[in-house]
């Protein structure tokens, strides 16, 4: 039950996170005009990854797409790439995790396969979340650098005679959405990885039982090998001899070793 809950919760958290990453990537407010000494402005500028917008106090808003690829800063291109990679990995992770959900039965899919898929989707969510967090952080760093540069050059002109107020940009809503969404995706991924450990079919720890063979007495102690990776059965370490005698408390159905509340 705990494994199902952990897996389900991990899926839902990741789903919310990836939806947030998509929303953040599409949002126009990655950077917004800094209203340092003027809380009410007649012309408000804000920029996204794909276009820049101007909102006037008249209510009119005009957005212009960045219709160039080569003319854009390399950092912006890098942020775009990170966000897209995050979305793609997250989307694939979601697809994989749907089939991996314990509550969903698909044909005669083995639990080991579900464990594999859960771990795969978990890793994908972790990488997706990291990509989003990295993308947003790179953009934030770029903003901070530009902010202090424009503060230093607040008034430019010949000998400071001509007053040309430079527009400073600060963190937009999309950055916070991106950070939170990336974090959620990361948490969801970790939860999926934790759930995977419980889903993995584990070898039962048998008690040592003595079997009397003809000739001399040999005590077989089938080792309680525990699948540490969470991936399927390991034939290398698999018990070759399965003793017939078991005590009652050892009879379990897979994968219920950790399936309790």
């Amino acid at each position: 039950m705990a494994v199902t809950a952990c897996q389900g919760l991990g899926f839902v958290v990741s789903l919310i996170g990836i939806a947030g990453i998509i929303a953040a990537t599409c949002m126009d407010q990655w950077s917004t005009q800094d209203l340092y000494n003027n809380p009410v402005t007649a012309v408000f500028n804000y920029q996204g990854l794909w276009r820049s917008c101007v909102r006037e106090s008249s209510g009119f808003t005009e957005c212009r797409g960045y219709f160039t690829l080569l003319g854009l800063p390399a950092m912006l291109q890098a942020v775009r790439a990170l966000m897209i990679v995050g979305i793609v990995l997250g989307a694939i992770g979601l697809l994989v995790s749907i089939f991996a959900l314990k509550c969903i039965r698909i044909g005669s899919m083995e639990d080991s396969a579900k464990a594999n898929m859960t771990l795969t989707s978990g890793i994908m969510f972790i990488v997706s979340g990291l990509c989003a967090i990295a993308g947003v952080s790179v953009f934030a760093n770029m903003l901070v650098t530009n902010f202090w540069m424009s503060t230093a050059n607040m008034y430019t002109g010949m000998g400071g005679m001509v007053q040309t107020v430079q527009t400073r940009y600060t963190f937009g809503a999309a950055l916070f959405v991106g950070w939170v969404a990336g974090g959620l995706t990361l948490i969801g991924g970790v939860m999926m990885c934790i759930a995977c450990r419980g889903l993995a079919p584990e070898e039962t720890n048998y008690k040592a039982v003595s079997y009397h063979a003809s000739g001399h007495s040999v005590a077989y102690k089938p080792g309680g090998f525990k699948a540490s990776t969470g991936f399927g059965s390991n034939t290398k370490n698999k018990k070759i001899y399965d003793g017939g005698a078991r005590t009652e408390d050892e009879v379990q159905s897979y994968p219920s070793k950790h399936d309790y509340v």
Epitope: T41, A42, E56, S57, S58, V162, T167
Partner: antibody, heavy 115, light 113 residues
Framework: EVQLVESGGGLVQPGGSLRLSCAVS?????MNWVRQAPGKGLEWVAW????????TYADDFKGRFTISRDDSKNTLYLQMNSLRAEDTAVYYC???????????WGQGTLVTVSS | DIQMTQSPSSLSASVGDRVTITCKSS????????????LTWYQQKPGKAPKLLIY???TLESGVPSRFSGSGSGTDYTLTISSLQPEDFATYYC?????????FGQGTKVEIK
Amino acid sequence: EVQLVESGGGLVQPGGSLRLSCAVSGYTFSMNWVRQAPGKGLEWVAWINMYTGEPTYADDFKGRFTISRDDSKNTLYLQMNSLRAEDTAVYYCARLTKGNGMDYWGQGTLVTVSS
Amino acid sequence: DIQMTQSPSSLSASVGDRVTITCKSSQSLLNSGNQKSYLTWYQQKPGKAPKLLIYWASTLESGVPSRFSGSGSGTDYTLTISSLQPEDFATYYCQNAYSFPFTFGQGTKVEIK
């Protein structure tokens, strides 16, 4: 078609108060009050976002004048307190449009501050 | 606050003349976000409310005759009437539409010569 009709102007004593109204019909996102003293130029008084009610004022009118709106009546107001002789002017309400220009204006209402 | 200075304060011209009015702002009205200058021009006739002629320094308001044109960027702007008509005799105002408080120029009165 946008229509703006001002009312509430008149004669008031110095230190007195007056409330101007501007009946609005048609789409307006944000509105302004602009005044013009006799024989003088245009002077912007205040702006309001008709949806949020967020206002802003010219420095000379902060604390004395209050711009507001009543959604149910579709009316814009300018509450003027502590009036002075120099506040004598024709007061216009005007709609803000693209480029922050004022495309629709009321006919104006005259406010005379005199003892 | 941004100060707006218009020149001349008045001018006399004949019908058919080309008239140029200039407006200077104490700060740039050019918005970096959309590369548009937030300067507006109005025409006002005695006893009437002002009429919007041009916004964004050079965009003609719908219904305004094409003989009116606006130009300029940064701090220097111009309103040009290519061929003055009898109905164009009025007072013209420029307005800072870039930042609050909105400020107007003192006006330029165009009179018949």
